[in-house]
Amino acid sequence: YDFTNCDFQKIEADYLRTISKDLITYMSGTKSTDFNNTVSCSNRPHCLTEIQSLTFNPTPRCASLAKEMFARKTKATLALWCPGYSETQINATQAMKKRRKRKVTTNKCLEQVSQLLGLWRRFIRTLLKKQHHHHHH
C-alpha cells in the first residue's frame, strides 16, 4: 500500500490521543532507553510503511502484535485516514485469523514495540519539520 495520500495530521492526532497510550501500556514500564533503535524511516509515507510492517507482520520471535489494542487502533486509524487502505487489508486479516496463538509478551515483542514507538516519533517529527518549514514560507 502507498501511504502518500494519507491525512497525516489526523493520523498524528489519533496516535497522540490513543495509540501512544496503548503502546506504552503494552510496554508495562519498560523504558525506550532499554533497547537500541534499529529501525528508522525517512519521511511520512515511509514511516507508515515501517509502522504497518512492524505492527501487523508476524516475526518468528514476536508473532501476535496484530491482536493487541494498539494494533487494532492503528489499523482503524489507517483505514480511516488512508484512502483505499482497508480494501488492501481484507485478505491479510483473514489470513491472520487462521494464525491465532496464545498471548505471551516476550522480550522480543517489547523490543519490537519499542521500535514502533521510535517510528511513531520519527513520523511526528517529520510532520513537525514539514509544518515548521511551510510556516516560514
Partner: antibody, heavy 123, light 112 residues
C-alpha cells in the same frame, strides 16, 4: 491536579529502619508511571534512591541497594520506602516524585514532586 | 554510574541579564533514537525541585520560554535569556539515560 505527600517519622535511631510513605492524589498509582524516591542531605545535592512500577518492578541505586526496599500499595494509592541500618549519613530531606512517560515511551523526567520530609538519624 | 559535573557552582547575575550553566556527563547521553536523556531542574529556596527541561531541550509544561536547553552527547547548557528575581535557586542537571539516575552538584544562581 497531581499531588504527592510524604509522611513518616522525622526521627530515626541509628541502626534502625527509616520508613516513609508517599500518598498520591490526582493520579492512579497503577498508571504507566514510575514512582521515585530522591533524597537531599542538609545543604547538599540530590541523590536518586530508587523507583517502582505498579507491577512491583523496582530499580535501586547500587550504593543503597542492600538497604533499600520500595513497595507499592495499590489499594491505598501510595508507595513506600524502607531504608535499613541507618546512620547519621542518611539524615536528609526525602522526596517522592512521579516519572511519567511522554508520548514515545520515554521516562526519566520527574514532573511532580512531594514537598519533602526531613528525616534525622540520631539517638 | 554516570558522573555529572556542573559549572559554575555559583552564579551571581544582574536582573535582565542572561545566564548560562554548563553540565558535563562522564559518558554520552545520546541514545540511538537521537535524543539526549538530560533534564534540568530548579530548586527554589525551601521548595522541592521543579522540572524545567527534559530530553536536553524540551521545555516542561508551564516553564517560561526564557529558559532553553541545548547540547548533545556529553556537553549541555541551560540558558536563561533574561534573569528575573524569581529565578533564584539551585539548578541541577540530571542524566536519565540509565539508572541510577545521577545529578550534578548544583549551580546556585543569585541576584547581584
Amino acid at each position: 491536579q497531581v499531588q504527592l505527600q510524604e509522611s513518616g517519622p522525622g526521627l530515626v535511631k541509628p541502626s534502625g529502619t527509616l520508613s516513609l510513605t508517599c500518598a498520591v492524589s490526582g493520579d492512579s498509582i497503577s498508571s504507566d508511571n514510575w514512582w521515585n524516591w530522591v533524597r537531599q542531605p542538609p545543604g547538599k545535592g540530590l541523590q536518586w534512591i530508587g523507583e517502582i512500577f505498579h507491577s512491583g518492578r523496582t530499580n535501586y541505586n547500587p550504593s543503597l541497594k542492600s538497604r533499600v526496599t520500595i513497595s507499592v500499595d495499590m489499594s491505598k494509592n501510595q508507595f513506600s520506602l524502607k531504608l535499613s541500618s541507618v546512620t547519621a549519613a542518611d539524615t536528609a530531606v526525602y522526596f517522592c516524585a512521579r516519572d511519567a512517560p511522554n508520548d514515545y515511551g520515554d521516562y526519566g523526567f520527574f514532573d511532580y514532586w512531594g514537598q519533602g520530609i526531613l528525616v534525622t538519624v540520631s539517638s | 554510574d554516570i558522573v555529572m559535573t556542573q559549572s559554575p557552582l555559583s552564579l551571581p547575575v544582574t536582573p535582565g541579564e542572561p545566564a548560562s550553566i554548563s553540565c558535563r556527563s562522564s559518558q554520552s547521553l545520546l541514545h540511538s533514537n537521537e535524543y539526549n536523556y538530560l533534564d534540568w531542574y530548579l530548586q527554589k529556596p525551601g521548595q522541592s525541585p521543579q522540572l524545567l527541561i527534559y530530553l536536553g531541550s524540551d521545555r516542561a509544561s508551564g516553564v517560561p520560554d526564557r529558559f532553553s536547553g541545548s547540547g548533545s552527547g556529553t556537553d549541555f547548557t541551560l540558558k536563561i535569556s533574561r534573569v528575573e528575581a524569581e529565578d533564584v535557586g539551585i539548578y541541577y542537571c540530571m542524566q536519565a539515560l540509565q539508572t541510577p539516575y545521577t545529578f550534578g552538584q548544583g549551580t546556585k544562581l543569585e541576584i547581584k
